[in-house]
């Protein structure tokens, strides 16, 4: 028995760790799933942040783990990405769905960021150069589409390289290799890590390495 309080909780189940798996919501004392109609990275970002796994990695249209059971609580979830909880996103109404089955249970993959790395290369020091990120064991780059000083500020702060002095595109620090991990990132400049900016998903891009982005931070400029 419970006495008042919010009657909603969120968890990820049957994943590799606490930051991945099938999305389940507890509403009115009952755990249920979320249908994948309209599933998006914005919804995943909200879930990851809510669960203290701030890095949204991907939004599988279905739970890669086993299908859930019980009620399907949410469908057509539409988030802006800045909501504090999944239930602040728009949806069809609690328990309302368009003939979803548990084969359509939504899943997410988040990360606490501990397995991610970032570095600047080919700039002459650790605080300037081409942006490279290590994800899933592979180093890759960031596309310059819509890259701006806010992105650079996040990177410089994250690398403890002071403030952002400038940013560049068009592979100003040479063309990288491997995956292009990010494209069209949206940062407000206050994020604690570049991967906490809004993005369309890891490895989703329409770029080539001629568009690799770079930055120069204040500590790097001092060393030049």
């Amino acid at each position: 028995s419970s006495l008042g309080g919010t009657d909603k909780e969120l968890r990820l189940v049957d994943g590799e760790n606490k930051c991945s798996g099938r999305v389940e919501v507890k509403v009115q004392e009952e755990w249920g799933t979320v249908c994948n109609n309209g599933w998006s990275m914005e919804a995943v970002s909200v879930i990851c942040n809510q669960l203290g796994c701030p890095t949204a990695i991907k939004a599988p249209g279905w739970a890669n783990s086993s299908a859930g059971s019980g009620r399907i609580w949410m469908d057509h979830v539409s988030c802006r990405g800045n909501e504090s909880a999944l239930w602040d996103c728009k949806h069809d109404g609690w328990g309302k769905h368009s003939n979803c089955t548990h084969q359509q249970d939504a899943g997410v993959t988040c990360s606490d960021g501990s397995n991610l790395e970032m570095r600047l290369t080919r700039g002459g020091n650790m605080c300037s150069g081409r942006i490279e990120i290590k994800f899933q064991g592979r180093w890759g780059t960031v596309c310059d589409d819509n890259f701006n000083i806010d992105h650079a500020s996040v990177i410089c702060r994250q690398l403890e390289c002071g403030s952002a002095v400038s940013f560049s595109g068009s592979s100003n620090f040479g063309e990288g290799s491997g995956p292009i991990w990010f494209d069209d990132l949206i940062c407000n400049g206050n994020e604690s890590a570049l991967w906490n900016c809004k993005h369309q998903g890891w490895g989703k891009h329409n770029c080539d390495h001629a568009e690799d982005a770079g930055v120069i931070c204040s500590k790097g400029a001092d060393l030049s």
Epitope: S1, S2, G4, G5, T6, D7, K8, V27, Q28, E29, E30, R71, W87, D88, C89, K90, H91, D92, G93, W94, G95, K96
Partner: antibody, heavy 116, light 107 residues
Framework: DVQLQESGPGLVKPSQSLSLTCTVT?????????WNWIRQFPGNKLEWMGY???????NYNPSLKSQISITRDTSKNQFFLQLNSVTTEDTATYYC?????????WGQGTTLTVSS | DIVMTQSPSSLSASVGDRVTITCRAS??????VAWFQQKPGKSPKPLIY???SLQSGVPSRFSGSGSGTDFTLTISSLQAEDFAVYFC?????????FGGGTKLEIK
């Protein structure tokens, strides 16, 4: 279709316990839904009191503290509201209400007067 | 508890009028607001759930809107059978709470 029918004593003395019954037809209370009690005071103010889910879990309005208990008898397809130590402030129309999450199905209500 | 403040408390209108009733929550309730209609001697009838979704069988002249803290119930063209008391309620968190009601009367 789900139909709910409240029944109760109509008149109760202060400090006594109140027991109301909701008889459900057309649907099993163990199949689905939350089974709520809501009351409406003179002057129209509505107050959600609590529910018992189809699986038997209860949740109560904290304002009623330890005064309230909601139970059920699955064999009779009924659920119950017990309110201890009633006062004249508990005079109201009591509704049993159900739905998956929303208050979709309402009984017609039973009026309770607390008076000596 | 979340307080739902409804306005106006009473309203006079004529058949054919467009009528708007508002409800304000003391904190954000996302879109988790429902609207009910109650006629004398009857139980409340659900009209709208999740701020803007019409309950089955409810005429399309009823509509709801809003999110966060401010919500509206609109009757586009008032019919004789619409004169009643209307309540909002929040479904966002426990305990569920209701507005004080708006009595819609014939002018």
């Amino acid at each position: 279709d789900v139909q709910l029918q409240e029944s109760g004593p109509g008149l109760v003395k202060p400090s006594q316990s109140l027991s109301l019954t909701c008889t459900v037809t057309g649907y099993s209370i163990t199949s689905d839904y939350a089974w709520n009690w809501i009351r409406q005071f003179p002057g129209n103010k509505l107050e959600w009191m609590g529910y018992i889910t189809y699986s038997g879990i209860t949740n109560y309005n904290p304002s009623l503290k330890s005064q309230i208990s909601i139970t059920r008898d699955t064999s009779k397809n009924q659920f119950f509201l017990q309110l201890n130590s009633v006062t004249t402030e508990d005079t109201a129309t009591y509704y049993c209400v159900s739905g998956t999450y929303y208050f979709d199905y309402w009984g017609q209500g039973t009026t309770l007067t607390v008076s000596s | 508890d979340i307080v739902m403040t409804q306005s106006p408390s009473s309203l006079s209108a004529s058949v054919g009028d467009r009528v708007t009733i508002t409800c304000r929550a003391s904190q954000s309730v996302s879109s988790d607001v429902a609207w009910f209609q109650q006629k004398p001697g009857k139980s409340p009838k659900p009209l709208i759930y999740y701020a803007s979704s019409l309950q089955s069988g409810v005429p399309s002249r009823f509509s709801g809107s809003g999110s966060g803290t401010d919500f509206t119930l609109t009757i586009s063209s008032l019919q004789a059978e619409d004169f009643a008391v209307y309540f909002c309620g929040q479904d966002y968190t426990s305990p569920r709470t209701f507005g004080g009601g708006t009595k819609l009367e014939i002018k």
